[in-house]
């Protein structure tokens, strides 16, 4: 793809960061719940 560099865009990066943040929050919540239930 001749314009491959443009796939590494800031908007795509922000979306990836938002997904990471969401997953971290969900996994963190699950972990806390597991600890609480022990």
């Amino acid at each position: 793809h001749s314009d491959g560099i443009f796939t590494d865009s800031y908007s795509r990066y922000r979306k990836q960061m938002a997904v990471k943040k969401y997953l971290a929050a969900v996994l963190g919540k699950r972990y806390k719940q597991r600890v609480k239930n022990k």
């Epitope: 001749s2 491959g4 560099i5 443009f6 796939t7 590494d8 865009s9 800031y10 990066y13």
Partner: antibody, heavy 112, light 110 residues
Framework: SVEESGGRLVTPGTPLTLTCTVS????????LSWVRQAPGKGLEWIGI??????SYYASWAKGRFTISKTSSTTVDLKVTSPTTEDTATYFC?????????WGQGTLVTVSS | AQVLTQTPSSVSAAVGGTVTINCQSS????????LSWYQQKPGQPPKFLIY???NLASGVPSRFKGSGSGTQFTLTISDLECDDAATYYC??????????FGGGTEVVVK
């Protein structure tokens, strides 16, 4: 984040290699550029490596610089035969033509 | 080869005022909007301000506004603050995976 290293004082004609070390993202999905700034001057784009594979250069930089991926976390900039005109701070920056992560830069001085 | 021309090279304005910086490209940028803006202070790396011509990067105040398309772009800074004193650069991305920077505009805040 990105971090540059390797800047030093060199004599004209002595090849020099600068290294950009990345963390927190994969080179296989990123575009990484080298940008330089001579003392008191503006920003000058040298070239870019896309997804760690293909390299593209500014027309003035072709043959003078080589950008290559050297490990899963490092990209090198080789200055083939430095001249005094290459004295500058060299920055590594992530992004495909829009640079959203910058390093602090590494200073290269070319002098006899 | 593409050329990005920034005007003016220097501009001075009072605190609370407005400055406008122009960036003209010799050819259309990728997708007609692949133009970004940066702020740089002495001894520091550039700071990413605006992407795809008009979108504000995270944490950048809404006093900064980017506009334009194709070959003609503008950065407007309103309600100027002392902290806005810096050099501003535009950068364009072009088909063929080529990038270029404008020559920079020094903003002096009085």
């Amino acid at each position: 984040s990105v971090e540059e290293s390797g800047g030093r004082l060199v004599t004209p004609g002595t090849p020099l290699t600068l290294t950009c070390t990345v963390s927190g993202f994969s080179l296989s999905s990123a575009a990484l550029s080298w940008v330089r700034q001579a003392p008191g001057k503006g920003l000058e784009w040298i070239g870019i490596i896309d997804k760690g594979v293909m390299s593209y250069y500014a027309s003035w930089a072709k043959g003078r610089f080589t950008i290559s991926k050297t490990s899963s976390t490092t990209v090198d900039l080789k200055v083939t035969s430095p001249t005094t005109e290459d004295t500058a701070t060299y920055f590594c920056a992530r992004g495909g033509g829009e640079f959203f992560i910058w390093g602090q830069g590494t200073l290269v001085t070319v002098s006899s | 080869a593409q050329v990005l021309t920034q005007t003016p090279s220097s501009v001075s304005a009072a605190v609370g005022g407005t400055v406008t910086i122009n960036c003209q490209s010799s050819k259309s940028v990728y997708n007609n909007n692949w133009l970004s803006w940066y702020q740089q202070k002495p001894g520091q790396p550039p700071k990413f301000l605006i992407y795809q011509a008009s979108n504000l990067a995270s944490g950048v105040p809404s006093r900064f506004k980017g506009s334009g398309s194709g070959t003609q772009f503008t950065l407007t800074i309103s309600d100027l603050e002392c902290d806005d004193a810096a050099t501003y650069y535009c950068a364009g991305g072009y088909s063929g995976n080529i990038v270029g920077f404008g020559g920079g505009t020094e903003v002096v805040v009085k």
